[in-house]
Every structure is written in structure tokens, then in C-alpha cells.
Amino acid sequence: MNGRVDYLVTEEEINLTRGPSGLGFNIVGGTDQQYVSNDSGIYVSRIKENGAAALDGRLQEGDKILSVNGQDLKNLLHQDAVDLFRNAGYAVSLRVQHRLQVQNGPIGHRGEGDPSG
């Protein structure tokens, strides 16, 4: 019997301040360059070590950015999303979606050391 892969999806508000390397991360996605199939959302592709996002510690590679300073990133061309970041100013508030992979064991089996619930 195979284990089942589930995802725990959480949302978080992250406030970052631009520094010498900017916000310290890069993005991919948009309606014109889908990063995830059937999803035109904007995703964090890479986080710079020692950059603003890394120092804050909450943003993760693969996170989906839902909004920037309250402005929705749904159904935007990549460049339009870039423009939102450009106009966001010095302090930037990001609403992000973390998607954590949870590996479940075979149904009906509780591994040694697992909490009994």
C-alpha cells in the first residue's frame, strides 16, 4: 500500500523592507508564462541569501504571492506583476500562500514513534 501525499496550505502576511539587493527574491509565473500548470499565479522562484526576505525568514521558495500591498496578483501578465512590485515602494506587504507537502503513511498503519492522536 502506498503512502498518500497531502498538502497543508496556509496563508501569511509578510512585511518586507527593500534593501541594497531589493526585496531579496525573484518571481516566476503570470498568465503569459505559467509556472504551475493550470495556474497563472505568481510564485517565488529563488531567495537570496542575506537578502531582505531571507533575513525575515518567512518567505520560502515555491510560495505563491497572492497580493502586494493589498493588490491582487490574480490573472496578471508577468510584466504587470513586476509593475505592481515596482510601484509598491520601500515597505512592501505580501500576502503569500505556503504549500507544505505532508507525507502520510499507508492507511491504517501507524509508524513507531508516531503520535497516537
Epitope: R18, G19, P20, S21, G22, L23, V82
Partner: nanobody, 130 residues
């Protein structure tokens, strides 16, 4: 390849002036943030000044005496140092950071003096006030 080359250091008497230059290559300096740091013998490297397209910062110890400026056409940043004091004696380095930002925007920001921000450093130029 990003390169920073400092020049303009030398020996000067107290109260004198020097102008340091930081010539940048491998990128366009008007988009990047450039800072000056200095390191005196036996001391930690410390932030002196920082300039971006939208903000400028100075360490308290040099405010009113040093002025940072940039010439984007020459891809060069300058540090004009007036009313020099013996305690300004140090090796002066310029530094820049690789921009990782969806919009390509970067600023000095209030914590510009943190050494960890900076990815690229010049070889330094010696300033001696004596």
C-alpha cells in the same frame, strides 16, 4: 563580471580633503546601490556612506564632512571627504549588492551598514590623515 575599483586615497594633513572614486564595471551603477566602508588597523570594517537612485545615508561620524555622489554616465561613485581627522585613517572600500527583486529596484535602506548585504567589494584604497 562585476568589478569595483577604488582610487583617490593618499596621505593628507588633518583638516585636508580627498575625493575617492569607485569605478564600477559589469553592471549599470544607476540601478545598483553603492556603499563605502572603511577599515582601520585592528578594527572592524564599518559603513561610511551609501547611495542609491532614491536615498543616501551617512555614518554619524562623517555627517557634514563627507559627501557621496554618482556620475551614471561614467559608472562611478565618489566620496568627497572634507575636514579630515586622524581617526578617518583607514582602507576605504566600495561595495555593491546583486539585485534580487521582481522589479529590479533596490535602495540603501536604514540598515545599509550591515556587511552581509554586500556581495561585491573593491580592493580598497588607503587614506592616511597625519
Amino acid at each position: 563580471e562585476v568589478q569595483l575599483v577604488e582610487s583617490g586615497g593618499g596621505l593628507v594633513q588633518p583638516g585636508g580633503s580627498l575625493r575617492l572614486s569607485c569605478a564600477a564595471s559589469g553592471f549599470t551603477s544607476d540601478y545598483y546601490v553603492i556603499s563605502w566602508f572603511r577599515q582601520a588597523p585592528g578594527k572592524e570594517r564599518e559603513g561610511v556612506s551609501c547611495i542609491s537612485s532614491s536615498d543616501t545615508y551617512y555614518a554619524d561620524s562623517v555627517k557634514g564632512r563627507f559627501t557621496i555622489s554618482r556620475d551614471n554616465a561614467k559608472n562611478t561613485v565618489y566620496l568627497q571627504m572634507n575636514s579630515l581627522k586622524p581617526e578617518d585613517t583607514a582602507v576605504y572600500y566600495c561595495a555593491t549588492a546583486a539585485i534580487w527583486d521582481p522589479s529590479g529596484l533596490a535602495v540603501c535602506g536604514s540598515s545599509w551598514y550591515r556587511r552581509g548585504w554586500w556581495d561585491y567589494w573593491g580592493q580598497g584604497t588607503q587614506v592616511t590623515v597625519s
